[in-house]
Amino acid sequence: EDWQCPRTPYAASRDFDVKYVVPSFSAGGLVQAMVTYEGDRNESAVFVAIRNRLHVLGPDLKSVQSLATGPAGDPGCQTCAACGPGPHGPPGDTDTKVLVLDPALPALVSCGSSLQGRCFLHDLEPQGTAVHLAAPACLFSAHHNRPDDCPDCVASPLGTRVTVVEQGQASYFYVASSLDAAVAASFSPRSVSIRRLKADASGFAPGFVALSVLPKHLVSYSIEYVHSFHTGAFVYFLTVQPASVTDDPSALHTRLARLSATEPELGDYRELVLDCRFAPKRRRRGAPEGGQPYPVLRVAHSAPVGAQLATELSIAEGQEVLFGVFVTGKDGGPGVGPNSVVCAFPIDLLDTLIDEGVERCCESPVHPGLRRGLDFFQSPSFCPNPPGLEALSPNTSCRHFPLLVSSSFSRVDLFNGLLGPVQVTALYVTRLDNVTVAHMGTMDGRILQVELVRSLNYLLYVSNFSLGDSGQPVQRDVSRLGDHLLFASGDQVFQVPIQGPGCRHFLTCGRCLRAWHFMGCGWCGNMCGQQKECPGSWQQDHCPPKLTEFHPHSGPLRGSTRLTLCGSNFYLHPSGLVPEGTHQVTVGQSPCRPLPKDSSKLRPVPRKDFVEEFECELEPLGTQAVGPTNVSLTVTNMPPGKHFRVDGTSVLRGFSFMEPVLIAVQPLFGPRAGGTCLTLEGQSLSVGTSRAVLVNGTECLLARVSEGQLLCATPPGATVASVPLSLQVGGAQVPGSWTFQYRED
């Protein structure tokens, strides 16, 4: 039977235990918020908030400035002092709930859990490549704020998301806060609001528009705001909330809320349910139709996509897509299927679906029984009626009231369940060349950088490495600064290159030079690296062949052996066709003549595994000595492949030339009819790849082969006679003169 090269798993070409050290900053406490700034004069900064403190870092993550944001009531609180002499409210620690840039000024705005959730504005003062914060301004006017009406009460201790939008000369803060009965009773924060920053930075203009969970639902209906972003003409909030006001509050789902970014009003507030599922290629018995639902959004990010993913999503390259990581429930641990799935929602499609939903509600003829929804924000009503009213009045428009679109937007896991046990806790998507890369942080403190592509049954990793030794979860919010992403884990901020932390996790030259161009990987003799790591020997254009195994491990000194070589970078072409004169194999001093590929033996090799085979005929030279020697494969003048050309030599020891010796044959006679079981004894009888016992020139069928013994069944004899018996190994006769006597049956 033909010997076949063992498959090498694809994973063997990389090592995700390789340690990478990326720049980091120890903040001195659990990182609560982080935002980056890049100015137009090459100045940049990272702002990092922990309890009671705000750090300003340079682009190198070195501390530039530090500001005390608490505790409230403490004389050392610098932001509190900006509000003038106190007291301003109950004393206590300040946990930063909001940290955003107002791009118009530019300025940094921070809002904390203390002092009724008020905010502070810090002008950015770029000096050289560094950025400093000016003295803080207190965005709170005591005489404008009351417990029942507080335009300057922004942050909720339960969590707040803010997106700042410039409209004309004004900055509008789109604010979404989680509420409960206790929070709602204290200085009346709102669930969703749009607030204009006053020109004199003394707070927010009164009379702002808002939606809030109705008092009767506050106890049972809580909305978590997971992410907010601004793209095109809209601001979007992503929420996790109970699927129904009336049913089980623990049955959660994910919604997208859309607000106009051009008009500071909430009449066109729209919500849409986002449905993300895992639909395995082969459905298990009893598995739900359409796939297993993953209703709870954990993290999200929107980004323009590269060409390849755009094609798969049937959209144009560069279009904005919302990516979300979903889990099955709040605890994130499902019974079956992966822990995390990733779904992609093109923004244009979301908008189209919302707009169609508005038409369904408001167009004639009326769709009976179609609800306006959002009963936690407004009185129940049926389309096209406004909330709480039986009918439209002549001067109101159906379109000028908030609406839950009746249909949901369903998508399936881009990764096809391949994230498996990984619990993703952070997500940022970038477009590199025409590739779309998901940069994901995990529950156990790792960073996964993976190409977002739908059509494969394995993950295409840029990298997969541990941020540090703490193993603490990577936090939800990720920021970009130039060509780096900033991830927070525990009390540390880490700076990760979007191109990946390095190339050392690629173990083979072939894998190294097949890496994405943007990674800048090259081969350095025996490791994969970036040019700065090994400037002398670094190259990106060729790989030597790599021998990993061969068969057999021994061959006869006289006679030929069919040698099978295993490894990688033999051909670069799936057909395995070798141009004349490119591959030279020597075993010891002896050449091994390349054999043409037997096309009937070509097997498709899945990308998850890889191995290349090369066969040659070994004919030892007369000068070849008995004993151990090396197998050497040299490839030259090969036409280049897609990523590199093969060029170089690979040597593997462990082949031995041996001289088979035949010592005894028994029995020396047998019936003319044949079938006598002959036993040939000797040494090195199993070397090489072919052997034959000839009785009067006819092959004696081999039943067993070992190093010291051959068993075969004699062929029938023509007549009763003594006939020559010989052993050939590799086509050459083993010395010795033996006869076998055919007798009458």
């Epitope: 050392g76 504005l121 002008d123 000016a134 003295a135 301004a137």
Partner: antibody, heavy 117, light 108 residues
Framework: QVQLVESGGGLVQPGGSLRLSCAAS????????MSWVRQAPGKGLEWVSY????????YYADSVKGRFTISRDNSKNTLYLQMNSLRAEDTAVYYC??????????WGQGTLVTVSS | DIVLTQSPATLSLSPGERATLSCRAS???????LGWYQQKPGQAPRLLIY???NRATGVPARFSGSGSGTDFTLTISSLEPEDFATYYC?????????FGQGTKVEIK
Amino acid sequence: QVQLVESGGGLVQPGGSLRLSCAASGFTFNSYSMSWVRQAPGKGLEWVSYISSRSSTTYYADSVKGRFTISRDNSKNTLYLQMNSLRAEDTAVYYCARGYFHGMDYWGQGTLVTVSS
Amino acid sequence: DIVLTQSPATLSLSPGERATLSCRASQSVSFDYLGWYQQKPGQAPRLLIYGASNRATGVPARFSGSGSGTDFTLTISSLEPEDFATYYCQQYYNMPYTFGQGTKVEIK
């Protein structure tokens, strides 16, 4: 090189008004916080007022709050101090100074304001 | 308000001697937010030290700052004739910004 030149000082009667100007050159004016500091004859330094680079934040010493207004025009690289309801105790040399987090690293030569009847 | 108290009010020393000036705050000042200034008669103040211990541009190495919390020190390791002047500390940690009353270093 960095230069700050104050102007607008002079003699004024109690209850009167003056507007001080500080012309800045040699640096990116709209990247720096600015302050006014005064020094009464034979006395120490007293901080008067502060304005952040984009005018978002202004602060005043209690002694001048409600009477003085600090402002800036970044397009003209000029800092102002509008002084109303002047009193005899406002008599001093008024300096404009650049900076906040790295201290007040550059000062003008000062302009004298005398409030007297 | 944070009150800064400088001592001594006057320091009489000879050229070449070491001068140690003290500034005490009524409440803690983060070391990032304290400066020292030198002023000569008829001239504007000049920044010597910012962030309690960082020398400003062009300031000779004989000037050094130290301290944290409520106690800060300006040291002139060896007085030069041009160093005889009045020295002020200033906090810019919290509004209102405040100066110490000054220490006059005079020739003995």
